[in-house]
Every structure is written in C-alpha cells, then in structure tokens.
C-alpha cells in the first residue's frame, strides 16, 4: 500500500514569495507522484515546478495559486492511486491603484455644494486599512465636512466648496505591506469669485518695426482686474507707460498692442488677473525679436559626371529657426528628382555636364532673407590638343615639349623625367597651358619625358624621347691665365667635345710657331724646360666639320714660385713687452706679405696703434696681453702661387724674483727681450 | 508696422520714360527681396520684376525685359522701377511689395497711364 | 514659363457657406504656393503661403492644402468681409505667375 509520510498543508503565503507543499510517500514498488490543482494535473514552469515529490513555487501568484491542491501517487505497476489531503494557500497582497472620482458620474458636473465621492482603487487581503491625503497632508475622519468610509474606500466631500481643492491620494496598509494610489485625483471647485484664465498670452516672435500682439483675458463673480507688467515689473497702462514702451496700447479686452518693436522691447511681459478673493494668477509671455545672421560662403565644388553629391546648405542663426531652400537658374528645386533639395543639402545624383552652374541657397525668416551661391563645376576627363613630340634640342639653348589638353575644370599637367617627378626649378618650368621649357638644355637631358593632365574626372598621359644636339665646347674651358715654373717642366692641357670628336691644335696669338722645346700633343700643351721666352698668349682651337671651330685664349706667366727666406718662430713674450714675428719671402712676381691671426686676416689698414706690418713683411705686436696669444701665419703670395707658414706667440705673467735668485739671472726659457 | 509707399505715376506718352519709388519703412528694407506687381484696369495681377535683398540678383518678365530697371538703395530705403520705351499696354497700378518666402506686404500702388 | 489657371472665374455664396477655390499649375511646383485676397480699389492682402500656411493675422477659417499641381483655397465659413476677389500665384521659379482670379460675389 501507498503511504503519505509527509502530507501537504495549508497555509500563509506572501504574493510573490518563495513557498513549498510538501509530499513524501512510501510504497513497495516504483511510484509516479504528480499534483492536482482543483483536480487538474499542474504542468511545470519556472515560477512552480515539482522539487522531488513536493511542490514548489519560486513566486506564490494570487491568481494562478489560488485553489485546491493535492499531491497524488501511483503505482504504475498495479495502478495503485492514493490522494494526500487538499490543501491551499491564504495569499496576502496589496496592489496599488488610482484614486477615481464615483460621484458625481463626470468632473464637468463638479459643482461648488455638490457632494464629491472619491474611491481609492487599493486592494488587497487581508483587505488593508486607507488613509486619505489632500496635497500631500493626511485627512482624519469627520474633519472639516468630510467622511471616510473604510470599507467602501471612499472619501465623501459632503458639500464640496472651494477649500476642497486639492490633489487627493490615498495610501493603505496591510499585514503584507503598504501601497499608495497609482494615479492622484484633481478636484478643483472653482470660487466664482477667484480669477480664471480665459484665454492665455502666447510667446511671439516678430522683426524690428513691426508690431506685436498678445491676448490676455481672465474671469470671475464680480470681474476680475487685469494688469499687464514688462520684465522689470513696470506696469503698463494707457495712462502711464514706461519710456520704453511708448507705443503700447492695452485694450479693453484685456489685449496689448506694441508697435514699431524694437530690441528693446523684447522680453517678458506678464499678464496678472485678480479675483475679488483668492490669489492673482500671472501668465508669462515672452517677446523675441526675429533676426536672421549672414550665410558661410561656399567653396566652388567640382563634382565629376555619373556621381552623387551633395552639398549642405547651413542655415544661418536666426530667430524662428530660418527656412532654406535651393535654386539653380531661378528655379527653386524640388524635393525628389535627379537634382533636388533633401532637408538642407542640394543633391546631384547621376551628375550631368549640364548640371554645372551656379545655384543658390536661399534662407528666410520673419526677419529677413540671406542667399549664397556656389559654384559647381562638372569635372570632365582631358582630351589631347596637342601631344609632346620626340624632339632633337639643341644644348645651352632653351628646349619646350608641349603637352596641350582641354577639359573642365582646366586641368593639372605635371611631367616625369625618366618617371622622376619634375618640381620647378631654375632649369625646367611649365607654363599654365602644359608646355614643359628646359631653360638650358645639358647633354644628360636626353632622356624619355612623360607628361600627365589630370582632373578629378580622369587623366590621359604620353610621352616623348628628347635627343641632345651636344655644341662644340670646350671641356672643361682652359683657364685664362696660367702660371709656369720658371726652368721646370710644364703642361698645359685643353680638351673639347661636339658631335663629332674635334681636332685640337696649340698656337701663340700672335701667330708665331711654337719653339722646338715645346709640343703640342693631342691637345696638351707641352713645355719641356721653361724659359722666360715662354710667357705669352696663346691659343687653343679646337674644330670639327659640322660645327666648325672654337677658341680659348690663354695667357702664360713664368714665374719663380714662391720660398720663405725667413720664417716666423715660436715665441715667448712678458705682458706688457713687445713681439717680433719675422716673416721674408721671395719668388717672381715678387710676393706680398699677409698675416693671420687668430683665425682672421689683419687687415694692416685696421690694426691700430699696438700692431704694424713692416716692409719686409715682420709683425710687431707692442704691449702683448695673454689674448694675443695663439697661432699667427705669414701667407706670401704673388699672381702665380700662395704659401703660408705658422708659429706660436705665447703671452706670459713675468714673474717675481725670488729672493735667491740675482738680478740677472736668465729666464727658465727663451724670451724676446725688448 | 510696415508700410511701403508707392509714388511716380502719372500720365506718359508712348516711348517716353517715367521712374517709380516705394518708399519703405517699419521693417528693417535691407534685408527684403522686394517685387514689381501690376494690374492692367479691370485685369489680374501681373509679376514685372524682383530684386534681392543685396541686389546683386534682379529677374523680370518677359514683357518688361530690356525695357524696365529694377533697383534699390538701401540706405534711402527705396525701391525703384525706371521704365524705358513705354507702351499703352504698361498702363497699369504698379504695386511694390515685400518677400520673405512669398510676398506678404503690398503697397498701395500707384497708376501709371500711357497715352498719346 | 509655368500657367497657373483658377476656377471657377467667379462664384456666388451667401454668408455661412463653406467655399472652394482651386489652382492648378502647369508643371510641378511643389508646395511653393501663395494665395492673396484683393477687394476693390485696395492692394491685395497675404493669405497663405507654402500652399498651406497662414499669414500672420489671418483668420483661422482660411486655409489652403496641396502640393506639385493642384491646389486649394477653402474658406470654411463665409463672413461678410470675405466678399474678394483671390489670386493663387507660383513662387517655385521666375517668371513668378499668377492665376487669372476668382471672384467670390454675394448670392
């Protein structure tokens, strides 16, 4: 037999919490245990679920937990059946609700010494206890005209006078909880001598000059009295309007005119109306004045055929927000199409040549109107006027490749050298039509030249192969003057290019031959042993057949290079004593003597009183200081040849004998004594 | 309150000239396309020219191209119409009137005759 | 150049009626609409603009409705005062154009 050792029970349940009805069985075989509710199977969910043979309910719902439960085993074996005891739950909740009105049926009925019920919509088991409040204050029972009837819910206003007034909730409580009114109930029992609105002031907006109007009307038993203030609590009265508001007119109506607006008038201006009793209600309107700012300018556009764009037009500030719209041609667009005006931005889809124009973006309010145009350009790809040509140029003189291409907008030519960028410089410009100049064509421009012309819509490109026609010259030019060592060996070279190798021959100007001991070999000049005899003129020529002959005269010294005959010494000087640099040259033409000085040259015409240079070409340094101190060159130098050699001058502290020491005792080193 | 003042009318005999003001005030005038409007005697009315605020764009009808001016200064606050080579089907009231998206101030006008 | 044509030319109401006007365009003009009202011997006076909105101080039983070519002017409860003539007019593109008028007469 199937026994219940743990029976199910009623019970106390919370709404919403946890419970479990307990089932434990026993029997001798296998048994299926499954719960009836008011005797139908109940199937599993997330909220109630069997936990072993009992049941369990993650949330108690007042609703769907309400009934009659039993927990029923079986054994399939023999189909044995035993049923537990019912049980059920006592579920305590509280729900919140509104407060409505029940009598009278409509709040249009709602008359002052009319009866006013209000029922408050919390329920709940146990069925909780209600208190009632007027704007947020608690009402107690049998306090000043009215009645609350707990069990009914509901507060009766019995009559309901103007001190009714007020924003009624209620709140209740149970043994489960608390809950106050979902949605608050408005009672408003006009006293027909308090002012009400009739018609309200609106807030208005108008342009400088014009003129402004706002409404105000109030009523009440006897009428009310009506003010109109501005902003600083100026009132305003036909009698007596403040400065500023000269041209403000107040009608009987209750209505105020202003005319001729301007900046200073704008603001708010308050409506106050005053019943007989109760308070003044003041309405508030406020004045704007419309004004309407400058448009951005728009940058041209260049858009490129088959595309969409669009373009936004910004609306200036203004006051009311400004209205746009867009126009092309004295046509405003429209709002769908090819072309057309989305919100505020023009759009081109599928853009044609033929879009390309000026449009206009228009913008207006109440206080004015503000356009901008921009220009739009429809890019097309370039096409060839005239292409660059494989061309012969002709060295140091100027050369030009062109690279004419039409398009829109003008297009942009660039050029590559051997596919190097050209960037302008003092050799290469293009000009604004393309066309490429080298200034001074050198023989390593021969080389491929690309031109591209481009526009947002595409670019074309050719090229070209530029042949240097090479001049004849000489390579490099022999110098002008040169010098020769007197009874030495000396060669004088001359070499020159075209475009066929030149022949080079050696002759003195003044037509003379050229003595044995000299020979003039593929174009170097040789001297065997020269002699004074050997100074002169001379000139290189150098010639082919198609470009002819060249000339670079040369004028020959023969000169005795330069030897010191003395040189400066190392030099050890006292403070305040005198220096002797010596420094002779010799050599033809005979040399000039220049000194140097810490690292600048002294100019004898700027040495002052304490330095001079002699004829001979020694430095005297009087009255040394330590910065006197340092290197000093002598640099010989004639039209032939430069040396240069050095020494040190030291500047030292004289010292102070010792007492040992005689009076002529010689320095420890070797000092110019003066 | 805005108020736009037409004068200049008159009597004018064909192919003569003759030059209309509209003298503008209680409105800030730069800042307003202004129109030509007119109306034949006993006819509809007919839009003659339009100027913008600036006036740097002014369009007209074709039956008054080449033959009318439309212009304004700002600093007088004036409108003007110089008509050119008149005819006696440009006897009309010539009214000035004031845009901001579509005309919403007119003038009084003023009635130009053209008779020999 | 865009035709605007009215009709009816002219109607007869009395006092209280609702009245309709219509305008049609010859090619779409969005909503770029204006409607004005001209009495004898006066200049016209604003009505409606954008094919729909009230001029500053016009009376609220004045409106106007449409968009592209057909429009209209709707008077919803005739007042003496309302005795006009009424023009529509484009303002979609140049030449602006109006229409020939409809005169409203008392019946």
């Known amino acids: 037999a199937i026994v219940f050792i743990k029976q199910p029970s009623s019970q106390d349940a919370l709404q919403g919490r946890r419970a479990l009805l307990r089932c434990e069985v026993e029997a001798p075989g296998p048994v299926h245990v499954y719960w009836l509710l008011d005797g139908a199977p109940v199937q599993d969910t997330e909220r109630r679920f069997a936990q072993g043979s009992s049941l369990s309910f993650a949330a108690v719902d007042r609703l769907q937990d309400s009934g009659t439960f039993q927990c029923v085993a079986r054994d399939d074996v023999t189909g044995e059946e035993a049923r537990s005891a019912n049980a059920s739950f006592n579920i305590k909740w509280i729900e919140a609700g509104p407060v409505v009105l029940k009598h009278p049926a409509s709040e249009a009925e709602i008359q002052p010494q009319t009866q006013v019920t209000l029922r408050c919509h919390i329920d709940g088991h146990p069925r909780p206890t209600y208190q009632w409040f007027r704007d947020g204050t608690p009402l107690s029972d049998g306090q000043s005209n009215h009645t609350v009837s707990s069990k009914e819910r509901n507060l009766t206003l019995r009559p309901a006078g103007p001190e009714h007034s007020g924003l009624y909730s209620c709140c209740a409580h149970s043994a489960f909880g608390q809950a106050c009114s979902s949605q608050n109930f408005t009672l408003s029992i006009a006293d027909e001598s308090f002012a009400r609105v009739v018609l309200a002031p609106q807030d208005v907006v108008v342009a400088r000059y014009e003129e402004a109007m706002f409404h105000c009307q109030f009523s009440a038993q006897p009428p009310p009295s009506l003010q109109w203030l501005f902003e600083d609590e100026t009132p305003i009265t036909n009698r007596s309007r403040p400065p500023h508001l000269r041209r403000a007119t107040v009608f009987a109506n209750g209505s105020l005119l202003l005319t001729q607006v301007r900046p200073r008038n704008a603001g708010i201006y308050r409506c106050i109306g005053q019943g007989q009793r109760g308070p003044p209600i003041i309405l508030e309107a406020t004045l704007h004045l419309a004004e309407i700012e400058d448009m951005p300018l728009f940058e041209p556009r260049v858009f490129t055929a088959g595309s969409e764009e669009r373009v936004t037009c910004l609306p200036p500030k203004g006051l009311p927000e400004p209205s746009v719209w867009w126009e092309h041609a004295g046509v405003r667009l429209p709002t769908h199409g090819r072309v057309y005006q989305k919100g505020h931005e023009l759009v081109l889809a599928n853009i044609a040549e033929s879009d390309a124009g000026v449009y206009t973006c228009h913008a207006a309010n109440l206080a004015g109107q503000r356009r901008q145009d921009v220009n739009i350009t429809v890019a097309t790809v370039p096409s060839w006027l005239k292409k660059p040509q494989d061309s012969q140029l002709e060295e140091g003189k100027p050369g030009y490749l062109d690279c004419l291409t039409q398009a829109t907008p003008k297009p942009t030519v660039v050029w590559y050298r051997n596919q190097m960028l050209i960037s302008e410089d003092s050799r290469f410009e293009v000009f604004k039509n393309g066309t490429l100049r080298i200034n001074s064509v050198e023989v390593y421009d021969g080389t491929w030249y690309r031109c591209m012309s481009s526009t947002p819509a595409g670019s074309i490109e050719a090229q070209a192969r530029v042949q240097v026609l090479e001049k004849l010259k000489f390579t490099p030019p022999p110098q002008p003057q040169q010098c020769m060592e007197f009874d030495k060996e000396a060669t004088v070279p001359c070499s020159a290019t075209g475009r066929e190798k030149p022949t080079i021959k050696w002759e003195r100007a003044d037509g003379s031959s050229l003595p044995e001991w000299v020979t003039d070999n593929a174009g170097t000049l040789h001297f065997a042993r020269v002699t004074r005899d050997d100074a002169g003129n001379y000139t290189c020529i150098a010639s082919n057949g198609p470009q002819g002959q060249i000339r670079a005269h040369v004028q020959l010294t023969v000169a005795v290079f330069i030897t010191f005959k003395v040189e400066p010494e190392r030099t050890t000087v006292y403070q305040g004593h005198t220096a002797l640099l010596q420094c002779e040259a010799q050599g033809d033409p005979k040399p000039l003597i220049q000194w140097k000085g810490k690292d600048r040259i002294l100019d004898p015409t700027k040495l002052g009183p304490r330095m001079h240079i002699f004829q001979n070409g020694s430095l005297v340094i009087h009255d040394v200081a330590p910065e006197d101190s340092g290197r000093y060159t002598c640099i010989a130098g004639n039209s032939c040849n430069i040396k240069h050699t050095e020494a040190p001058l030291y500047v030292v502290d004289k010292p102070v004998p010792e007492e040992s020491e005689g009076p002529g005792s010689p320095p420890p080193y070797k000092m110019i004594q003066t | 309150q805005v108020q736009l003042v037409e004068s200049g009318g008159g009597v004018v005999q064909p192919g003569r000239s003759l030059r209309l003001s509209c003298a503008a005030s209680?409105?800030?005038?730069?800042?307003?396309?202004m129109h030509w409007v007119r109306q034949a005697p006993g006819k509809g009315l007919e839009w003659v020219a339009v100027?913008?605020?600036?006036?740097?764009?002014?369009y007209y009808a074709d039956s008054v191209k080449g033959r009318f001016t439309i212009s304004r200064d700002n600093s007088k606050n004036t409108l003007y119409l110089q008509m050119n080579s008149l005819r006696a089907e440009d006897t009309a009231v010539y009214y000035c009137?004031?845009?901001?998206?579509?005309?919403?101030?007119w003038g009084q006008g003023t009635l130009v005759t053209v008779s020999s | 150049d865009i035709q605007m044509t009215q009709s009816p030319s002219s109607l007869s109401a009395s006092v209280g009626d609702r009245v309709t006007i219509t305008c049609r365009a010859s090619?779409?003009?969005?909503?770029?609409l204006a409607w004005y009202q001209q009495k004898p011997e006066k200049a016209p006076k604003s009505l409606i603009y954008?094919?729909?909105s009230l001029q500053s101080g016009v009376p609220s039983r004045f409106s106007g409705s449409g968009s592209g070519t057909d429009f209209t002017l709707t008077i919803s409860s005739l007042q003496p005062e309302d005795f006009a003539t009424y023009y529509c007019?484009?303002?979609?593109?140049?030449?602006?154009?109006f229409g020939q008028g409809t005169k409203v007469e008392i019946k």
């Open positions: 009137a004031r845009e901001v998206w579509s005309i919403d101030n």
């Open positions: 209680g409105f800030i005038f730069s800042n307003y396309a």
């Open positions: 100027i913008s605020y600036d006036g740097n764009n002014k």
């Open positions: 090619q779409g003009i969005s909503s770029w």
């Open positions: 954008a094919a729909s």
């Open positions: 007019q484009q303002y979609n593109s140049y030449p602006r154009t």
